[in-house]
Structure formats: C-alpha cells, structure tokens
C-alpha cells in the first residue's frame, strides 16, 4: 500500500493474506473472506496455472504478518474460466477452505455489493493489504496491514489516463467494463496487495467494490491502480458461494 | 503411541453394504484431515476418500462417488467409511491414512482391513 | 482429473546400484509425494514435497522433478530397498496415486 497508515486493530476483520510454501510460508497476496468458507481473491494470485492445494494456505486477519500465524488449508481452488492475464480481466479466483471460520467481531466477511451498485467518484473507498509500500519498496518488519483511502475514478476517465503515452490506438480499450479504476500518485495498491479488497462505504455497509488487479507501476501519473469489479462477477461468485440467508 | 487400527471388514455379497471403522490414537484426532486408501490384491494403491478436520470438507474418487461415505466422530477418535451397492471390484484392503497438518502427506497408516466382496 | 504413471512398472537391480524411477503427471504439479510399501505391509511415507525425506528414511534416497516430471533415486541401492515405491500428486481433488514401480533383486 502506497501512502495511508497501519490499518487499526478493529478495521477490516475480512482481509486475509494467502501463503505460499517455501521455506516460510510467505505472503504473496491478499484476499477476502465473503463468506465463512470462501476466500474472494485475484485470478493472477493462484493461476492460471493453478498451485497445489499442498502450496497454498489462508491466514486470516492479523496485525502483523507471521507474528501469529494460524495457517488454514484450502479445499478447492477455482479460477475464473475466461482468465488469462489480468490485463486481459477476469482477474477473479475463489478459495474454499477445509473448514468455516469461527467469525467474531475481529474476523468476519464482507458484504458483497448489489448488482445495481456502480461506486461512482467521491464515495469513500479504502484499500488494505501487506504488499510493497512504493515502487520496489517492500513493507518493512513487523510488516502491519496497511489502509489507504483511495479515489475512484470513472472507467473512461482512467482509460484515457492510460492511453496517455501508450502505443495501444485510442480506440482500443484498456480499462474495460469489468475493471474500476482508483487511486493516485499519493495513494495506491502495489505489489503483494494483488487479491485484497478495496471496500466503500455505502449507507453505514462496507462493500466490496473491487479485487486489487493491475496497474502500470503503483502510484505512478495517469496510472491509477486497477481492480476487478466484483458486480461483474455476482453470477459467477454465487454459482459457487452460498448467498447469505 | 500414535496409532490408527482399522475394523470391520470381512466378506460381503455384491449389492451388500459394509461399514469400516478406524479407531485412532495418540494424536488429537480433530486436528487432523483423515483418508481411506484402498489396495485391491495384487494391485495399486487408491485413493478413497477424504474428510476434514471438522467434517466439513469431504472428497471422493469418482467410482466411489454415490456408493461411500466417509464420516468422522471426534468426540469419539473414530473414522468411518460407509460402503453400499457394493462390486467385486472393491475388493481390497482398505487403509486408515492420516494427513500431516504441515505438508498434508499421508504420515500414519493403519494395518488394514480386508474387504471381500464375493457371492 | 490427474493420473500419474510410474516407469518402469518394475526393475531388477543389484546392491549397491544407482536406481531412478520417474513419476510424470498428465498436467502440471507442484509437488509429488512418494510412499514405500513391502509385501504384506501398510505403506509407509517416504519423500514428501518432492525433495523433502520422511523420518527414518536414509540419505541416499532423493527426490527432484517439477511441472510433470519427478523422479525418486536411489544412489546405492541396499537390501532393505526392494519393495514397491508409489508416486502421488496433492494438486487438486480427487487425488491419485501412480501404479508403482517394484524394485526387484537381480
């Protein structure tokens, strides 16, 4: 997370880190818990050649990576069938865990957004994660969850951002309908924050608008950062994750 | 001692039903996924069917699908899998296996228990 | 579905041999598993995330491989090392073991 402040304790109970094994299990993105079985994270993170069950485990939310890990191992890995790279978009993946999480009021889900949801700019929006804290920057020990309050910007404002000094025809898209764009050079998401959740604050409810996807560099002029919106992919979410009683 | 002791197999008609028993000791059993694993004679290993720790989590091989069931009682240290409709070909000894919780290989093994399917 | 082939599905070999058995996946995997089992005996752990050697089992066993190649080698083979080896992925459900390979005295 560029810019922001260490997340306080109380904030964000659905932010989870995914670990990979190696010779720690060590943070590679972030994810969310929407459900006490269901972790949403980006295609990118575990595809599209899809790691071993044996690789991957979801550590859910703590204040400070690997200072009280309770790794929880993952039952199925589902990758959205029409990813390929995340530029191209379908950058959406769900994990199923072994077992529920017992929620309280430190781990709990998200909300999901209603279809009819389109997080307009000027809604206050945050994004959360363990990843770099500027460009090739990584997050120093005791490496905290960090927040940042980013802005949304509209999709044909951000396309034409990114067109800015491109060699892709303006008549290509870039930004397309199944993306959100926020961010700017003060505050952005980064490397190892691929996967996390940006949330909006929408009549008292935290949302999940967005899956931390791409971006050219973090931070960067007329590059904000680019995520997968998660009202795209309802139909998709629910073919597989219970909706809540 | 860390210990799982398999039980009641024996003979059976085609059609018939069978439930086995895996009596498991020495560990905290409800840490643990668990996994049958079959071995028909002179034959492979096969992988059965898979529980989590809680239950909450099962898998099966495609051709036991329908047919088995595994199930676990914690409270009691005991798996089970339930076996109906069963074929000559599930003939086999039928091993208890639990999952280490780090590297999720199959660490202990019970003996077996032989299951004969046959008129 | 993965399957797993073992080669050679048996060998015959000496003490004292350098032995290799391959295990090839029909698609990609991180790790393989491998088990040892002698006749009349529950099978027993043997090398685990592809390299890694379960306890009590003696150096000069290995284990390399990646994608869908791995193999488990034997440096010098000793008398206690015949029995039937089993290679196994843990990618994805349902999980499969490979048909075995039984190292046989010469």
């Known amino acids: 997370i560029v810019g922001g402040q260490e997340a306080p304790r109380s904030k964000w109970p659905w932010q989870v880190s995914l670990r990979v094994h190696g010779p720690y299990w060590m943070h590679f993105c972030g994810g969310s818990l929407i459900h006490p079985q269901w972790v949403l994270t980006a295609a990118h993170c575990v595809g599209p050649d899809v790691k071993d069950l044996a690789a991957l485990r979801v550590q859910l939310r703590e204040q400070h990576l690997y200072y009280q890990d309770q790794l929880l191992p993952v039952s199925r890995i589902i990758v959205h069938p029409q990813f390929y790279t995340a530029q191209i978009g379908a950058d959406i993946a769900l994990l199923e865990l072994e077992e529920p999480v017992n929620v309280s009021s430190h781990v709990h889900t998200v909300t999901l957004p209603p279809a009819s949801e389109t997080f307009p700019p000027g809604m206050p929006c945050w994004v959360t994660g363990w990843g770099d804290v500027d460009n090739d920057e990584r997050l120093p020990p005791p490496f905290p969850l960090k927040q940042v309050k980013v802005p949304i910007m509209e999709n044909h404002i951000c396309d034409a951002k990114y067109h800015l000094g491109a060699y892709t025809g303006d008549d290509v898209r870039i930004v397309r309908d199944d993306m959100l764009c926020a961010g700017n050079t003060r505050r952005d998401s980064c490397q190892g924050d691929s996967g996390g959740p940006l949330v909006c604050k929408v009549n008292g409810t935290w949302l999940q608008a967005g899956v931390v996807s791409w971006g050219e560099g973090c931070a960067q002029p007329n590059r904000p950062g680019i995520y997968t919106r998660v009202t795209y992919y309802l139909d998709w979410i629910h073919h597989y994750v219970p909706k809540k009683p | 001692e860390v210990q799982l002791v398999e039980s009641g197999g024996g003979l059976v008609q085609p059609g018939g039903s069978l439930r086995l028993s895996c009596a498991a000791s020495?560990?905290?059993?409800?840490?643990?996924?668990m996994v049958w694993v079959r071995q028909a004679p002179g034959k492979g290993l096969e992988w059965v069917a898979f529980?989590?720790?809680?239950?909450?989590?099962?898998y099966y091989a495609d051709t036991m699908k329908g047919r088995f069931t595994i199930s676990r009682d914690n409270s009691k240290n005991t798996l089970y899998l339930q076996m109906n409709s069963l074929r000559a070909e599930d003939t086999a000894v039928y091993y208890c296996?639990?999952?280490?919780?780090?590297?999720?290989?199959?660490?202990?093994w019970g003996q077996g228990t032989l299951v004969t399917v046959s008129s | 579905d993965i399957q797993m082939t073992q080669s050679p599905s048996s060998l015959s070999a000496s003490v004292g041999d350098r032995v290799t058995i391959t295990c090839s996946a029909s698609s990609s995997v991180t790790y393989m598993y491998w088990y040892q089992q002698k006749p009349g005996k529950s099978p027993k752990p043997w090398i685990y995330?592809?390299?890694d050697l379960a306890s009590g089992v003696p150096s000069r066993f290995s284990g390399s491989g990646s994608g869908t190649d791995f193999t488990l080698t034997i440096s010098s083979l000793q008398p206690e090392d015949f029995a039937t080896y089993y290679c196994?992925?843990?990618?994805?459900?349902?999980?499969?073991f490979g048909q075995g390979t039984k190292v046989e005295i010469k």
């Open positions: 196994q992925h843990y990618h994805s459900y349902p999980l499969t």
């Open positions: 296996t639990r999952r280490n919780y780090d590297d999720l290989y199959f660490d202990v």
């Open positions: 995330r592809t390299s």
């Open positions: 020495g560990f905290t059993f409800s840490d643990y996924g």
């Open positions: 529980i989590s720790s809680g239950s909450s989590t099962v």
